[in-house]
């Protein structure tokens, strides 16, 4: 029977240019995590961290994505087009699959700057 | 240039044990991962053991779990694989593989018969 | 576990034929497949790895593609030194497999 449950940072902003970090994290589960799988908005692997063989970064991502940390991935230079969402999916032993999802949206830096001065503290 | 140079391999008897070794050199060891696939006579491959950089974890698939054993010494770069309980399934040419999948040895042969 | 399947175990081939050596996966693995090579008393040897990339030093006759759950490896133009055993492995999910093989010979 699968009790875990993924926590992610759920949705989050940037600014175009910047960098942000995706995290996902399984709880409520003895089980072993075995890979995780890092996958953009189309579906697209981004990432593959193996428990034992460590990271594997798709090559057209290598120079924008950061493995880290832990089981998180960062991405880099942010560009509008990596608005979307993203997902985490855990394979674990002997649970089985977990899957999480996070929604990036990329701001234009003036707007961010924009949104960020009238936020409520 | 990445040399992986396995021995150990032989003939052994059903329910008998083996221990294979791994020889690396030309590449940091220390920073990849491991793992041992076999090639069946019917020349099927199988992943057996993969060890993490560090030696600090271990992922084996349930056909081998409990019967074999893959461990590392970084200090003198090398890998193990300790096999006991030997079945006649286990017979295969068994291959040292560097990180992911990017370098081979050439193999030792690994007989179980009586 | 995830079943790579290599349907053909031979295939029949002339030296400048252009030839495509198919595998299925048993579900979605994405884009983490890898192809090897394996020649007559020698170990298999990476190609291509993230379903198209290729490995330092393969020539680029080889090339790697994939449409949802089928993946391909194509050599555009056989040479001699092509004739080998093919094998397919996924890594989107432990424990990574490997497909049965083919062995691609002269007609």
């Known amino acids: 029977m699968m009790t875990g449950t993924i926590e992610t940072t759920g949705n989050i902003s940037a600014k175009k240019g910047g960098s942000v970090i995706l995290q996902c994290h399984l709880s409520s589960t003895m089980a072993q995590v075995t890979q995780v799988n890092w996958e953009q908005h189309d579906h697209s692997l981004l990432a593959i961290r193996n428990a034992e063989l460590g990271w594997h970064i798709y090559p057209a991502f290598k120079d924008r994505v950061a493995p880290g940390p832990g089981l998180g991935l960062t991405l880099q230079s942010l560009t509008m087009n990596d608005t979307g969402e993203y997902f985490c999916t855990y394979h674990t032993y002997p649970d089985g699959t977990y899957r999480g999802r996070i929604f990036l949206e990329v701001l234009e830096s003036s707007v961010a700057e924009h949104s960020a001065r009238f936020q409520i503290p | 240039e990445v040399q992986l140079v396995e021995s150990g391999g032989g003939l052994v008897q059903p329910g008998g044990s083996l221990k294979l070794s791994c020889a690396a050199s030309?590449?940091?060891?220390?920073?990849?991962?491991m793992s041992w696939v076999r090639q069946t006579p019917d020349k099927r491959l199988e992943l057996v053991a993969t060890i993490k950089s560090d030696g600090g974890s271990t992922n084996l698939p349930d056909s081998v779990k409990g019967r074999f054993t893959i461990s590392r010494d970084n200090a003198k770069n090398t890998l193990h694989l300790q096999m006991s309980s030997l079945k006649s399934e286990d017979t295969a040419m068994y291959y040292c593989?560097?990180?992911?999948?990017?370098?081979w040895g050439q193999g030792t042969s690994v007989t179980v018969s009586s | 576990d995830i079943v790579m399947t290599q349907s053909h175990k031979f295939m029949s081939t002339s030296v400048g034929d252009r030839v495509s050596i198919t595998c299925k996966a048993s579900q979605d693995v994405k884009t983490a497949v890898a192809w090897y090579q394996q020649k007559p008393g020698q170990s298999p040897k990476l190609l291509i790895y993230w379903s198209s990339t290729r490995h330092t030093g393969v020539p680029d006759r080889f090339t790697g593609s994939r449409s949802l759950t089928d993946h391909t490896l194509t050599i555009s133009s056989v040479q001699a030194e092509d004739l080998a055993l093919y094998y397919c492995?996924?890594?989107?999910?432990?424990?990574?497999?490997f497909g049965g093989g083919t062995k691609l010979e002269l007609k």
């Open positions: 492995q996924q890594y989107y999910s432990t424990p990574y497999t």
């Open positions: 593989v560097r990180g992911y999948f990017d370098y």
């Open positions: 030309g590449f940091t060891f220390s920073s990849y991962g």
